[in-house]
């Protein structure tokens, strides 16, 4: 930052994703002052014409808001005075993705710092018993991804196989035709093993874990964002 | 290499019309804001119009309000400025600049609008 | 509207420093840039949100905003320098424009 007569300030933004269809969260953080109504926040974005958000004087100010975003953000307005000025913004489009920019100006100086948001569906994986099989099967199911991911199979006894050839992965679009139902069917699987199904795009990275033993069956799930540094 | 090139200027009578184009290369052109910036001669510079990235929102100066339509072809990489109705004080250097936040990175040479009769 | 004011000129020996100021009312709560443009050429950003330099512009080109005034400064002044200088800020869903300052390098 380089020095104006009134200073630059530090502002902070850490790069995220949102999943489409829910409420994401764009992390701005700044140097705190203590009167709120000394504080204005602008957001903007790569792109667009109008304001994402404009926030000062201690009130929302969207009369310069774009269309795109009218009725879908909101900033966390008790939290301004502490420094954050990170933006919530309601029912995630898949064309929200791209460079955002978080503009600052206190009483101690202005700042500003762009963001980059990724957009997409991720959703954690479900590994079941497949009963209904002739062999011992497994069936890993997540219900929303986008972009199309890949699926991978592990397992904790053979490390380092590849069970490529004994699984079969199909993707099936879902009803508002973005996103796709991921469903992936390991077979020939042997007792006392645990198995990971992950499944991986651009934007997330999921796993989803079975323990199969003669006595009991364990399942565990993980879901991970990729290139956020949150 | 980012670049902008207009074209389509020329000499034209008071009341008629005139399209302007200008060809973006170098850069995801349907992923920014384009602007028209027009500068009359020995004159400073004045904004014309604004265009979002897909096109959906458009801003324009007051004085060409009614009279000039931005659009683009993102297919193409062009912006366009359709100008109806022109006025001598119309007459200028027709510049497209890309938006860069609250500022305009990236300019074109020029093309040139004289409206006389 | 908004209004930026510049002066109509800017005289500086070489290898001084020359100051090219921009008025307008709460400036300081704008972000402005600022533009070269030389004769018959197409303007050049030279300075962008107050006190930022685009890729390629010399060190000596600086910005600083404060109150109602910006100041773009100019050290060790060069001939190639000598073009009109325009502010700019964005208002109320317009661009705003200086109304440009001719340097002369004497």
């Known amino acids: 930052f380089g020095i104006s007569g009134r200073h630059s300030i530090t502002v902070t933004t850490v790069a995220s994703a949102g999943n489409i269809g829910e409420d994401g969260i764009l992390s701005c953080t700044f140097e705190p002052d203590i009167k709120l109504s000394d504080i204005v926040i602008q957001w903007l974005k790569e792109g667009v014409l109008g304001l994402v958000h404009e926030f000062k004087e201690g009130k929302d100010e969207l009369s310069e808001q774009d269309e795109m975003f009218r009725g879908r953000t909101a900033v966390f307005a008790d939290q301004v005075i502490v420094g954050n000025a990170s933006l919530r913004l309601k029912n995630v489009q898949l064309t929200d993705a791209g460079t955002y920019k978080c503009y600052i100006i206190t009483s101690k100086g202005k700042g500003n710092a762009n963001l980059e948001y990724k957009t997409g569906a991720f959703s954690m994986p479900e590994v079941n018993v497949d009963y209904n099989a002739s062999s011992e099967t497994l069936r890993c199911e997540a219900p929303r991804w986008f972009p199309q991911p890949t699926v991978v199979w592990a397992s904790q006894v053979d490390q380092g196989a590849n069970f490529s050839e004994v699984s079969n992965t199909s993707f099936e679009l879902n009803s508002e035709n973005v996103t796709m139902k991921v469903v992936s069917v390991l077979y020939n699987v042997t007792i006392n093993n645990t198995y990971s199904c992950m499944i991986e795009n651009d934007i997330a990275k999921a796993t989803g874990d079975i323990k199969v033993t003669e006595s009991e069956i364990k399942r565990r799930s993980h879901l991970q964002l990729l290139n956020s540094k949150a | 290499e980012v670049q902008l090139v207009e074209s389509g200027g020329g000499v034209v009578q008071p009341g008629r019309s005139l399209r302007l184009s200008c060809a973006a290369s170098g850069f995801t052109f349907s992923s920014r804001s384009m602007n028209w910036v027009r500068q009359a001669p020995g004159k400073g510079l004045e904004w014309v119009s604004a265009i979002s990235g897909s096109g959906s929102t458009v801003y324009y100066a007051d004085s060409v309000k009614g009279r000039f339509t931005i659009s683009r072809d993102n297919s193409k990489n062009t912006l366009y400025l359709q100008m109806n109705s022109l006025r001598a004080e119309d007459t200028a250097v027709y510049y497209c600049a890309r938006k860069r936040w609250y500022g305009m990175d990236v300019w074109g040479q020029g093309t040139t609008v004289t409206v006389s009769s | 509207s908004y209004e930026l004011t510049q002066p109509p000129s800017v005289s500086v020996a070489p290898g001084k420093t020359a100051r090219i100021t921009c008025g307008g009312n709460k400036l300081g709560d704008k972000w402005v840039h600022w533009y070269q443009q030389k004769p018959g050429q197409a303007p050049v950003l030279v300075v962008y949100?107050?006190?930022d330099r685009p890729s390629g512009i010399p060190e000596r080109f600086s910005g600083s905003n404060s109150g109602n005034t910006a100041t773009l400064t100019i050290s060790r002044v060069e001939a190639g320098d000598e073009a009109d200088y325009y502010c700019q800020v964005w208002d109320s869903r317009t661009y705003v424009f200086g109304t440009g300052t001719k340097l002369t390098v004497l």
């Open positions: 949100e107050d006190v």
